[in-house]
């Protein structure tokens, strides 16, 4: 069915991290081009990536308008050089994506330990509050701004001389942990949204260890 010499897109897949959101699909076009439309449940379809030979479309600008809405995208196929052509139903051949709710589904990007500071037997570990592409009042919001208390960080820490890990959790971007005086520790953090059903955890941050550049030490 559909327009002669065009095939419908398939394997429509959302790829999203910290709200940077790209729709990918197959196949690589042969004598055809694609246009993407995206809508919330309002059915107000907006066209993007007009007549492209790419098999991906950056939809970030649309989904960041309201990350708690649920979105659907559809990919239209047109014969190259004849984009006015329509299918047997009087419209171009198209396929729908799965539904996508950014707030519930965007992957949490790998966090970064911004700094750690030791004061006596306490260490303050600070996680970088990553900027997202979500805007409010013309300023970009951080991950914490968007998720608020829904987002927690888990800290994994261990003595450099052993492998036994301890954990701590925070609803802010800072940890204050007790350490043994005179011991060096290593740290790694993970972003977590406990209320989620999918994509609950980020990958672990790179490991940072005391005695390296990011640390500050005070007696």
């Amino acid at each position: 069915s559909g327009t002669t010499n065009t095939v419908a897109a398939y394997n429509l897949t959302w790829k999203s991290t910290n709200f940077k959101t790209i729709l990918e699909w197959e196949p690589k076009p042969v004598n055809q081009v694609y246009t993407v439309q995206i809508s919330t449940k309002s059915g107000d379809w907006k066209s993007k990536c007009f007549y492209t030979t790419d098999t991906e479309c950056d939809l970030t600008d649309e989904i960041v308008k309201d990350v708690k809405q649920t979105y659907l995208a559809r990919v239209f196929s047109y014969p190259a050089g004849n984009v006015e052509s329509t299918g047997s139903a009087g419209e171009p051949l198209y396929e729908n994506s799965p539904e996508f709710t950014p707030y519930l589904e965007t992957n949490l990007g790998q966090p970064t330990i911004q700094s750690f500071e030791q004061v006596g037997t306490k260490v303050n570990v600070t996680v970088e509050d990553e900027r997202t592409l979500v805007r409010r009042n013309n300023t970009f919001l951080s991950l914490r701004d968007v998720f608020g208390k829904d987002l927690i960080y888990t800290l994994y820490y261990w003595k450099s001389s052993s492998s036994g890990k301890k954990t701590a959790k925070t609803h802010t971007n800072e940890f204050l942990i007790d350490v043994d005086k005179g011991e060096n520790y290593c740290f790694s953090v993970q972003a977590v949204i406990p209320s989620r059903k999918v994509n609950r955890k980020s990958t672990d941050s790179p490991v940072e260890c005391m005695g390296q550049e990011k640390g500050e030490f005070r007696e």
């Epitope: 069915s1 809508s39 919330t40 449940k41 309002s42 059915g43 107000d44 379809w45 809405q69 659907l72 047997s88 139903a89 419209e91 396929e95 729908n96």
Partner: antibody, heavy 118, light 106 residues
Framework: EVQLLESGGGLVQPGGSLRLSCAAS????????MGWVRQAPGKGLEWVST????????YYADSVKGRFTISRDNSKNTLYLQMNSLRAEDTAVYYC???????????WGKGTTVTVSS | DIQMTQSPSTLSASVGDRVTITCRAS??????LAWYQQKPGKAPKLLIY???SLESGVPSRFSGSGSGTEFTLTISSLQPDDFATYYC????????FGGGTKVEIK
């Protein structure tokens, strides 16, 4: 609770006009496409028209195109169907429905009856 | 327009029976199909969307399957409340309904 309540049905002569209304409550009206579906006596369901949340996109079945106009007033949470040049075959129960993406109908009103007869 | 054909048009069954209703599309509609239940004098009620996704609050004895042109609605164990007319609806290209299947008491 999500509710849809149709009104405006009645008896009208062939060639006449009617305006149906559908009052919505229990959800953010402008966030959803809405539609009208009708059912002639003893018959199956027939899609009539759909409108997007902003009102910017409208779709019609061929059987009503040029005669019926769908519209909405988001400030009043109300959907409308203006029916002109009515025919005997337009006689039906008219249902208003909430229609995510304009695709399927997840909440329906109880319906209002339109009878076109001389 | 895409035509939707339901079979059978009438089905006689008993409480506890496994019931299957078929819906065929005149061309491929992928998984863009919904199922509704309607009782006499009442509005239709959404049961299934996207061919197999169960609408919130619908009993798990209802299930949908299929893709492309052939779809089925299955009621695993028919209950007294399930005697009604069932409609399929495609939403791949505009909207069209099947003619309905009436499930009546044997």
């Amino acid at each position: 609770e999500v509710q849809l309540l149709e009104s405006g049905g009645g008896l009208v002569q062939p060639g006449g006009s009617l305006r149906l209304s559908c009052a919505a409550s229990g959800f953010t009206f402008s966030d959803y496409a809405m539609g009208w579906v009708r059912q002639a006596p003893g018959k199956g369901l027939e899609w009539v028209s759909t409108i997007s949340g902003s009102g910017g996109l409208t779709y019609y079945a061929d059987s009503v195109k040029g005669r019926f106009t769908i519209s909405r007033d988001n400030s009043k949470n109300t959907l409308y169907l203006q029916m002109n040049s009515l025919r005997a075959e337009d006689t039906a129960v008219y249902y208003c429905a909430k229609a995510p993406y304009g695709y399927y109908m997840d909440v329906w009103g109880k319906g209002t009856t339109v009878t076109v007869s001389s | 327009d895409i035509q939707m054909t339901q079979s059978p048009s009438t089905l006689s069954a008993s409480v506890g029976d496994r019931v299957t209703i078929t819906c065929r599309a005149s061309q491929s509609i992928s998984s863009w199909l919904a199922w509704y239940q309607q009782k006499p004098g009442k509005a239709p009620k959404l049961l299934i969307y996207k061919a197999s996704s169960l609408e919130s609050g619908v009993p798990s004895r209802f299930s949908g399957s299929g893709s492309g042109t052939e779809f089925t609605l299955t009621i695993s164990s028919l209950q007294p409340d399930d005697f009604a007319t069932y409609y399929c609806q495609q939403y791949k290209s505009y909207i069209t309904f099947g003619g309905g299947t009436k499930v009546e008491i044997k």
